[in-house]
């Protein structure tokens, strides 16, 4: 008799990353009998929800259900029907919603209420929506990349699964850049973490980790740009802002009300004699870099050393994975190669920012102008943040690896979040058995 293929004994999980600029849905899959093994969970699908982040729906809450439909229907298609009821769904909202909550807890709750009601109509095991803390965002990003890199596995491999993997059990640090916040997370070398708020203790797979993390709210690339504009318009002599972070020939009208809408610009707010102003690009990397540095207060530090704004930062240690917008921006600028030195990156940025806007539009005809116009700022901001903010140097630059995916799974906080909520990261090393029960048929 012919052997009949046994049904795949797999499980699925869904995480929605409700970021400040957009929402993405991730579907993960793993063998049911290997839940406690490291490296078995992998991403099978990413669905980017069309539209802005959920915090932008404050005035149109009734549209949230429709907004989520396409990606939730996609999940319904990808996951076998027999598994729907057992598949957990988690939604984590990040800095966009943290900012909305700062403005109004009631409005943030209203958005989350409608999100939860909408998601509960699907046949999955919906586990709620919540605003995760910056500390969680940093920690789960760190867990994700180290899980995918196999850093928690006790078995040392003689082969490398990714090009930049150093074949040891030293964990990678995590650098995450979003639209509204940025996170830095790593294990410092024998250094006490001087501020308790930045210290995390984990026991994973039988090993203890003392982890440093900090999330800089308002220092994601979009909010940093708003900050920079609010700072620079203070000293503008009229309603024209000549901006070195935009290409020569670029022009854009900005409403002052939009500029001051976010809590991130409150410190720069002032009464202006106009309701609108026009950005006129002049495309000068060096001046742009200087303007960005003014967002980082480095004059005050109550610790042995700081990043900026009086936030403790231990000496950098080991390799770092830089993902999310760190990766997307550098990938667009073609600067993710391991071989490109920091000096070369700076040189390329100088050239890129100096290119006329008309030329840029022609070269990148397929890219939306809104995004295209901001790559000069974003690239410059990344360099400023990493070099002056986090104190990377030309030498330590080679320890930064710009990562989009690791073994097919996106680098980011969502996988770590799901692993934690489904209890798939044991504190102790699971006992390895020669054959699992499912091996016997």
């Amino acid at each position: 008799t012919q052997n009949k293929a046994l049904p795949e004994n797999v499980k699925y999980g869904i995480v929605l990353d409700a970021g400040s600029s957009h929402t993405s849905l991730y579907i993960y899959k793993w063998p049911a009998e290997k839940e406690n093994d490291t490296g078995v969970v992998h991403q099978v699908e990413e669905c980017r929800v069309k539209g802005p982040g959920i915090s932008k729906f404050v005035q149109k809450v009734n549209e949230i259900g429709i907004y989520l439909t396409d990606c939730m229907e996609r999940a319904r298609e990808v996951i076998p029907r027999s598994q729907h009821q057992e598949t957990p769904v988690y939604l984590g909202a990040t800095a966009g919603m943290r900012l909305l909550r700062m403005e109004s807890e009631e409005l943030a709750d209203r958005v989350l209420d409608v999100v939860e009601r909408s998601l509960s109509n699907y046949p999955f095991d919906f586990q709620g929506a919540r605003i995760i803390t910056g500390q969680e965002e940093g920690a789960y990003g760190w867990i994700t990349i180290n899980y995918l890199l196999g850093k928690f596995s006790q078995k040392t491999r003689w082969f490398s699964i990714v090009p930049y993997e150093t074949n040891n059990q030293e964990t990678f640090g995590a650098l995450d850049l979003g639209g509204a916040s940025t996170q830095v997370t790593f294990v410092p070398q024998n250094q006490t973490i001087e501020s308790p708020d930045n210290a995390l203790q984990f026991r994973l797979y039988g090993k203890d980790y003392n982890v440093y993390t900090h999330s800089f709210l308002c220092y994601g690339k979009d909010q940093a740009l708003w900050q920079k504009l609010a700072k620079d318009i203070q000293v503008a002599s009229n309603e024209i802002l000549r901006d070195p972070c935009f290409h020569p020939g670029y022009k854009k009208v900005v409403n002052v009300s939009d500029l001051y809408k976010t809590p991130c610009t409150k410190r720069f707010e002032m009464t202006l004699p106009f309701q609108q102003f026009e950005i006129q690009g002049i495309g000068n990397y060096q001046q742009c870099h200087q303007s960005i540095l003014e967002l980082f207060n480095t004059s005050y530090c109550p610790y042995s050393q700081c990043a900026f704004n009086g936030i403790f930062l231990p000496p950098l240690q080991g390799d770092f994975g830089a993902f999310s917008a760190f990766y997307f921006v550098m990938k667009f600028l073609n600067l993710t190669s391991e071989k490109v030195s920091q000096e070369k990156v700076t040189e390329m940025m100088k050239k890129f920012c100096a290119q006329p806007w008309e030329e840029i539009k022609t070269s990148y005809a397929g890219v939306k102008e809104k995004y295209l116009s901001e790559y000069c700022f974003s690239g410059t901001y990344i360099l400023s943040l990493l070099l002056q903010g986090y104190h990377f140097t030309a030498d330590s630059w080679e320890h930064i690896h710009f990562i989009g995916k690791i073994q097919g799974s996106d680098a980011g906080w969502t996988l770590g979040y799901m692993l934690n909520l489904t209890n798939m990261i044991p504190a102790e090393q699971p006992l390895s058995t020669p054959l699992s029960h499912s091996t016997y048929v």
């Epitope: 809450v61 009734n62 949230i64 259900g65 009631e106 709750d109 209203r110 989350l112 209420d113 409608v114 939860e116 009601r117 909408s118 509960s120 919906f126 586990q127 709620g128």
Partner: antibody, heavy 119, light 107 residues
């Protein structure tokens, strides 16, 4: 003080539909949610679904999905619950109740509407 | 969905006695648990919300405690009007679910 007043008792045949109304008075109808809960004779309470009238956002218990429709009319401050393909097991008292904010319980209840399904 | 298990199903006590009702959730509901009282032919009435907060107009003899998965409703000294059915309900996750109820009857 907010009050919820429901429509009167109904007797229905199996396979038919019933539509129960719930009129709010003395408060801002649109800013909170209305939930529907039923109770079969001698049994416990069972949540069926709810709606936020201001946004038209309704959600339903999986058990009733496809058979229940919850709507609201802001102009008359009235919420409706329609249950189709009735069977004898649907004989119950149907309550509407207010749930004022996210993750809050039902703080104000209607008086209940008895629906009897019998051939 | 979250299953709420109430115990005991029936509690036979005399007026003036202390009543302790239990509600256990199949998974954590944080502190989003409410207690209702229902008398025959009447709609339920909210007694306690967010595990331990008394609703408007509820006498001080009613108190709630617990968080996560284990919750308790205590009636410090039973009054004749307290003999009724009591339900717990979670509002942490959808679908909203109720416990099966505890009937507090006169001994």
């Amino acid at each position: 003080q907010v009050q919820l007043v429901q429509s009167g008792a109904e007797v229905k045949k199996p396979g038919s539909s019933v539509k129960v109304s719930c009129k709010a008075s003395g408060g801002t109808f649109s800013t909170y949610a209305i939930g529907w809960v039923r109770q079969a004779p001698g049994q416990g309470l069972e949540w069926m679904g709810g709606i936020i009238p201001a946004f038209g956002t309704a959600n339903y218990a999986q058990k009733f999905q496809g058979r229940v429709t919850i709507t609201a009319d802001e102009s008359t401050s009235t919420a409706y619950m329609e249950l189709s393909s009735l069977r004898s097991e649907d004989t119950a008292v149907y309550y509407c109740a207010r749930d004022p904010v996210r993750r809050s319980p039902f703080d104000i209840w209607g008086q209940g509407t008895m629906v009897t399904v019998s051939s | 969905e979250i299953v709420l298990t109430q115990s005991p199903a029936t509690l036979s006590l005399s007026p003036g006695e202390r009543a302790t009702l239990s509600c256990r959730a199949s998974q954590s509901v944080s502190s989003y648990l409410a207690w209702y009282q229902q008398k025959p032919g009447q709609a339920p009435r909210l007694l306690i919300y967010d595990s331990s907060n008394r609703a408007t107009g509820i006498p001080a003899r009613f108190s709630g405690s617990g968080s996560g998965t284990d919750f308790t409703l205590t009636i410090s000294s039973l009054e004749p009007e307290d003999f009724a059915v009591y339900y717990c309900q979670q509002s942490f996750l959808w679908p909203r679910t109720f416990g099966g109820g505890t009937k507090v009857e006169i001994k």
